[in-house]
C-alpha cells in the first residue's frame, strides 16, 4: 500500500529502485531502461511501459538509465601505446589496456600511458611489474637507482643524491688503497 502524500511530499519522494520520476509529471514513476538501451519516450502513465530503444553501433549504456542518448564508445589512445582489450558493445564500453610486459602510468584519473616494465639490469627485481606499477629494482653494489634503472657509480656526480648510495663504495676503494700502503 502506498501511503497518502501531499503534493510537496510526493514531489520530494524518490521512486523505488529501478524507476525514475517522470520529468513532466512528478506523480508518475517510470521504469528505467535496461543497460544497452536508452530512453526514447517516457512512460505515458503509471504502470505503462517506458519506450526504450537499443543503442546504435558506436554507443553504449552500461547500467539501467533514463538517458536521452547512449554514451559514445571510448577509443583507445594509440599515441599513449594503448591497445584494445575488448571492443565496445551496446552495454559495455571499450576496454583499453597495455601489451604484455608493460604497465600503465596514469597521468590523471582517466588517462594512462603504456610503458615497458624495467628489467633491472645490474640489479635484482624487488617487486615484480604490476598492471599499474613498474618493476621495483634493487641495484647491485657499485650501482645506484636513477629513474628506475641501475646506473654505475662512476656516473655519480657529487651534487646528486647518489653520493649517499655510492659513498660506501668510494670509501671501500679508499680503504683498500690505504691498507695497501701500510
Amino acid at each position: 500500500l502506498v501511503p497518502h502524500l501531499g503534493d510537496r511530499e510526493k514531489r520530494d519522494s524518490v521512486c523505488p529502485q529501478g524507476k525514475y520520476i517522470h520529468p513532466q509529471n512528478n506523480s508518475i514513476c517510470c521504469t528505467k531502461c535496461h543497460k544497452g538501451t536508452y530512453l526514447y519516450n517516457d512512460c505515458p502513465g503509471p504502470g505503462q511501459d517506458t519506450d526504450c530503444r537499443e543503442c546504435e553501433s558506436g554507443s553504449f549504456t552500461a547500467s539501467e538509465n533514463h538517458l536521452r542518448h547512449c554514451l559514445s564508445c571510448s577509443k583507445c589512445r594509440k599515441e599513449m601505446g594503448q591497445v584494445e582489450i575488448s571492443s565496445c558493445t551496446v552495454d559495455r564500453d571499450t576496454v583499453c589496456g597495455c601489451r604484455k610486459n608493460q604497465y600503465r602510468h596514469y597521468w590523471s584519473e582517466n588517462l594512462f600511458q603504456c610503458f615497458n616494465c624495467s628489467l633491472c639490469l645490474n640489479g635484482t627485481v624487488h617487486l615484480s611489474c604490476q598492471e599499474k606499477q613498474n618493476t621495483v629494482c634493487t641495484c647491485h653494489a657499485g650501482f645506484f637507482l636513477r629513474e628506475n634503472e641501475c646506473v654505475s657509480c662512476s656516473n655519480c656526480k657529487k651534487s646528486l643524491e647518489c653520493t649517499k648510495l655510492c659513498l660506501p663504495q668510494i670509501e671501500n676503494v679508499k680503504g683498500t688503497e690505504d691498507s695497501g700502503t701500510t
Partner: nanobody, 120 residues
Framework: EVQLLESGGGLVQPGGSLRLSCAAS????????MGWVRQAPGKGLEWVSM????????YYADSVKGRFTISRDNSKNTLYLQMNSLRAEDTAVYYC?????????????WGQGTLVTVSS
C-alpha cells in the same frame, strides 16, 4: 597560490634550438606530473610533452618526438623543454602546465606562456 613562470622563448631560425624553462611555486612540485602545451596562431591547444613526478615516464606528441626533450629539476622546482631541429610549424605560444590528478588529459594550472617563433 600556484604560479608557473615560463621563459626562454624567442625568434629562432629553422633547424635551430631553444631551451624553455618553467619556474614553479605555490605547490609541492615533486608530487605532480608536469607538461608543456602549445597553441599555434589560430589553432587549438596541443599537448607537446609530459613528465612524471619522479619516475622515468615521459610523453611526447608524434610531431616533436626525437626533437624535443622534457626534463625537470625537482631540487629547483623547475621544468625544462629542450627544443632542437625547430621547424616553422613549431611556432606557437608554449605553456607550462601542472597536470591534474583528476579527470582526463586535464591541466589544472598553466602559466602565461612564452612565444616561440621559428622563421628565417
Amino acid at each position: 597560490e600556484v604560479q608557473l613562470l615560463e621563459s626562454g622563448g624567442g625568434l629562432v631560425q629553422p633547424g635551430g634550438s631553444l631551451r624553455l624553462s618553467c619556474a614553479a611555486s605555490g605547490f609541492t612540485f615533486t608530487r605532480y606530473s608536469m607538461g608543456w602545451v602549445r597553441q599555434a596562431p589560430g589553432k587549438g591547444l596541443e599537448w607537446v610533452s609530459m613528465i612524471a613526478h619522479a619516475g622515468p615516464e615521459t610523453y611526447y606528441a608524434d610531431s616533436v618526438k626525437g626533437r624535443f626533450t622534457i626534463s625537470r629539476d625537482n631540487s629547483k622546482n623547475t621544468l625544462y623543454l629542450q627544443m632542437n631541429s625547430l621547424r616553422a610549424e613549431d611556432t606557437a605560444v608554449y605553456y607550462c602546465a601542472k597536470i591534474s590528478q583528476f579527470g582526463s588529459n586535464a591541466f589544472d594550472y598553466w602559466g602565461q606562456g612564452t612565444l616561440v617563433t621559428v622563421s628565417s
